[in-house]
């Protein structure tokens, strides 16, 4: 058993039918010695008396808020949560496996640049009685500071019969140098509590591997005289690291017909312009990627050909 | 990434082309190592990230773009003295810092070259003959060093009398390639920045 926060305790249970569970001793936080009784949750049934209460925690019915009283007055509370270990592996009931980029991906993180700021998000089908707390650091043995905000509900989607909820959090490395070569990964730890169930999820990454630039901005077309060709131009996104001559991007320019079946023409360039043939009813899209370290491509920025 | 390869303009900063080739070569070699050594811990998540140049060179600090020198987190002042002549500086009025930067890059390349050559000698003794260093990568390191043209003491190739542990050597190769790829990215950024200025 360990303390998650003041008066909230996590009991780790080897979870299988007929498991013996864990013996837990609760102590009433009071100078009083006599006349103390214990109850669980809203029940008035007295579970025991005395300054300490010994319980055998086996199932969720044994978890909850234990309260010690004296003469009708509440003295202290202890909330017991359960953390299930199923055949050596901690349960992952609360969050959905996003399966991207690989199976068992519960937390996904992205950074728009090398400033040390990143966003993580996760999915759940649970709508109520759910709380998250996020901590992060650079490295684990001698951790360096990363500050994370509060996790917030960022999107709701309907998936088949189920509603899916997306939560996200923003974090910032306390002293980040955009040009630094990372040797220790960022560690992100999310504590999830649903009713009386506790779970924790972790992700470990280098900022360089989670870079996804914003789409190029100010995408414009300039028709070339007496030609079906157009000059496409764009600019680096505002959120990208500077100077751009050091943090360079490479670009992919795509001409896409109205029908998805039509052949796509693609050009790769390090410049911020390109000359392409603009077909009728087609659209031109441009996306960006770090020129030197192949992490994710940005989303497309698009303009119609007409 | 199978992207068209840009050919440098004739008047281009001489080292940019070489640094682009270097990054391409080390990335290809790392990809080959990951595939060939699939049953070894060779992915970024599995290896220890070690930098053999740590405390010996200070490329990131010495080559910091001017715009980032205001960022206190980037100023880890590690003082190292370097030789300050080099042909990449040709026909450019260059600050002392730029000379330090390029000589630091040269020292990095020299250290990695020695490590890779020592490692290749061991890998050639492996009866499995599973993996060797790409000669193209070694050649590209050499070309960039020549383009930098710094006079520096030659570092003798390390020789080891004991029987090599091939498993450890292959893991070390992965560690070295990951670190060298990261350094090659920094070198490419620096060359691109110097070329633009």
């Amino acid at each position: 058993i360990w303390e998650l926060k003041k008066d909230v305790y996590v009991v780790e249970l080897d979870w299988y039918p007929d498991a013996p569970g864990e013996m837990v001793v609760l102590t009433c936080d009071t100078p009083e010695e006599d006349g103390i009784t214990w109850t669980l949750d809203q029940s008035s049934e007295v579970l025991g008396s005395g300054k300490t209460l010994t319980i055998q925690v086996k199932e969720f019915g044994d978890a909850g808020q234990y309260t010690c009283h004296k003469g009708g007055e509440v003295l202290s509370h202890s909330l017991l949560l359960l953390h299930k270990k199923e055949d050596g592996i901690w349960s992952t009931d609360i969050l959905k496996d996003q399966k991207e980029p690989k199976n068992k991906t519960f937390l996904r993180c992205e950074a728009k640049n090398y400033s040390g700021r990143f966003t993580c998000w996760w999915l759940t089908t649970i709508s109520t009685d759910l709380t998250f707390s996020v901590k992060s650091s650079r490295g684990s043995s001698d951790p360096q500071g990363v500050t994370c905000g509060a996790a917030t509900l960022s999107a709701e989607r309907v998936r088949g019969d189920n509603k899916e909820y997306e939560y996200s959090v923003e974090c910032q490395e306390d002293s980040a140098c955009p040009a630094a070569e990372e040797s220790l990964p960022i560690e992100v730890m999310v504590d999830a509590v649903h009713k009386l169930k506790y779970e924790n999820y972790t992700s470990s990454f280098f900022i360089r591997d989670i870079i996804k630039p914003d789409p190029p901005k100010n995408l414009q077309l300039k028709p070339l005289k007496n030609s079906r060709q157009v000059e496409v131009s764009w600019e680096y996104p505002d959120t990208w690291s500077t100077p751009h001559s050091y943090f360079s991007l490479t670009f992919c320019v795509q001409v896409q017909g109205k029908s998805k079946r039509e052949k796509k023409d693609r050009v790769f360039t390090d410049k911020t312009s390109a000359t392409v043939i603009c077909r009728k009813n087609a659209s031109i899209s441009v996306r960006a990627q770090d020129r030197y370290y192949s992490s994710s491509w940005s989303e497309w920025a698009s303009v119609p050909c007409s | 990434r199978n992207l068209p390869v840009a050919t440098p303009d004739p008047g281009m900063f001489p080292c940019l082309h070489h640094s682009q080739n270097l990054l391409r070569a080390v990335s290809n070699m790392l990809q080959k190592a990951r595939q060939t050594l699939e049953f070894y811990p060779c992915t970024s998540e599995e290896i220890d990230h070690e930098d053999i140049t740590k405390d010996k060179t200070s490329t990131v600090e010495a080559c910091l773009p001017l715009e980032l020198t205001k960022n206190e987190s980037c100023l880890n002042s590690r003082e190292t003295s370097f030789i300050t002549n080099g042909s990449c500086l040709a026909s450019r009025k260059t600050s002392f810092m730029m000379a330090l930067c390029l000589s630091s890059i040269y020292e990095d390349l020299k250290m990695y070259q020695v490590e890779f050559k020592t490692m290749n000698a061991k890998l050639l003794m492996d009866p499995k003959r599973q993996i060797f260093l790409d000669q193209n990568m070694l050649a590209v390191i050499d070309e960039l060093m020549q383009a930098l043209n710094f006079n520096s003491e030659t570092v003798p190739q390390k020789s080891s009398l004991e029987e090599p542990d091939f498993y450890k050597t292959k893991i070390k190769l992965c560690i070295l390639l990951h670190a060298f790829r990261i350094r090659a990215v920094t070198i490419d950024r620096v060359m691109s920045y110097l070329n633009a200025s």
Partner: antibody
């Protein structure tokens, strides 16, 4: 105390369907994940499918994906395996098993797919 | 086909010590715990070892398990006639959990 009893096995022609049941008793069935495991005659053990305690997630072996469906009725303390488009290679003893470090197995039910 | 490899058979005289190996990879045994089962002819598998080296109550201390890196092994000391059975190791893969990975199985013969 914990008891699992499989039923529903038998002889069936290729391409036909069969539904196996596993009746659980002696524990809080709705709190635990459950597996189906099979064993072809003279062969080793092969995992077939898993279902979470609340039925929210189901996982299948590639060999049965798209043909078999695992489900549970927690109000009846029963686990099911719906087997469609049966093949000769599905012939095996089918066991249900609890998920956990100390697991409990049923006695198995024989499924024979033969024309 | 199983990704955990066991020898097809091992044998020993009564009173002898036999060991069964179970070889996997970094993503399965290297990252997860191992169980061992005994299966007597015509019966369901019986758990012998869990969490690599732990014995459930009722299993004789002649059976012991160990794990090192990407391999595990089961040792039976003081071999007895009733130990003649099939033995299976079981683990998980970190990417396909909760799918059970079983070993190929080993037939133990008491000479």
């Amino acid at each position: 105390q914990v008891q699992l009893v499989e039923s529903g096995g038998g002889v069936v022609q290729p391409g036909r369907s069969l539904r196996l049941s596993c009746a659980a008793s002696g524990f809080t069935f709705s709190s635990y994940g459950m597996h189906w495991v099979r064993q072809a005659p003279g062969k080793g053990l092969e995992w077939v499918a898993f279902i979470r305690y609340d039925g929210s997630n189901k996982y299948y072996a590639d060999s049965v994906k798209g043909r078999f469906t695992i489900s549970r009725d927690n109000s009846k303390n029963t686990l099911y395996l719906q087997m469609n488009s049966l093949r000769a290679e599905d012939t095996a003893v089918y066991y249900c098993k609890t998920h956990g470090s100390h697991d409990n197995w049923g006695q198995g039910t024989m499924v024979t797919v033969s024309s | 086909q199983s990704v955990l490899t066991q020898p097809p058979s091992v044998s020993g005289a009564p009173g002898q010590r036999v060991t069964i190996s179970c070889s996997g990879s970094r993503s399965n045994i290297g990252s997860n715990t191992v169980k061992w089962y005994q299966q007597l002819p015509g019966t369901a598998p019986k758990l012998l070892i869990y969490y690599n080296d732990q014995r459930p109550s009722g299993v004789p201390d002649r059976f012991s398990g160990s794990k090192s890196g990407t391999s595990a092994s089961l040792a039976i000391t003081g071999l007895q006639a009733e130990d003649e059975a099939d033995y299976y190791c079981q683990s998980y893969d970190r990417y396909t959990h909760p799918a059970l990975l079983f070993g190929t199985g080993t037939k133990v013969t008491v000479l």
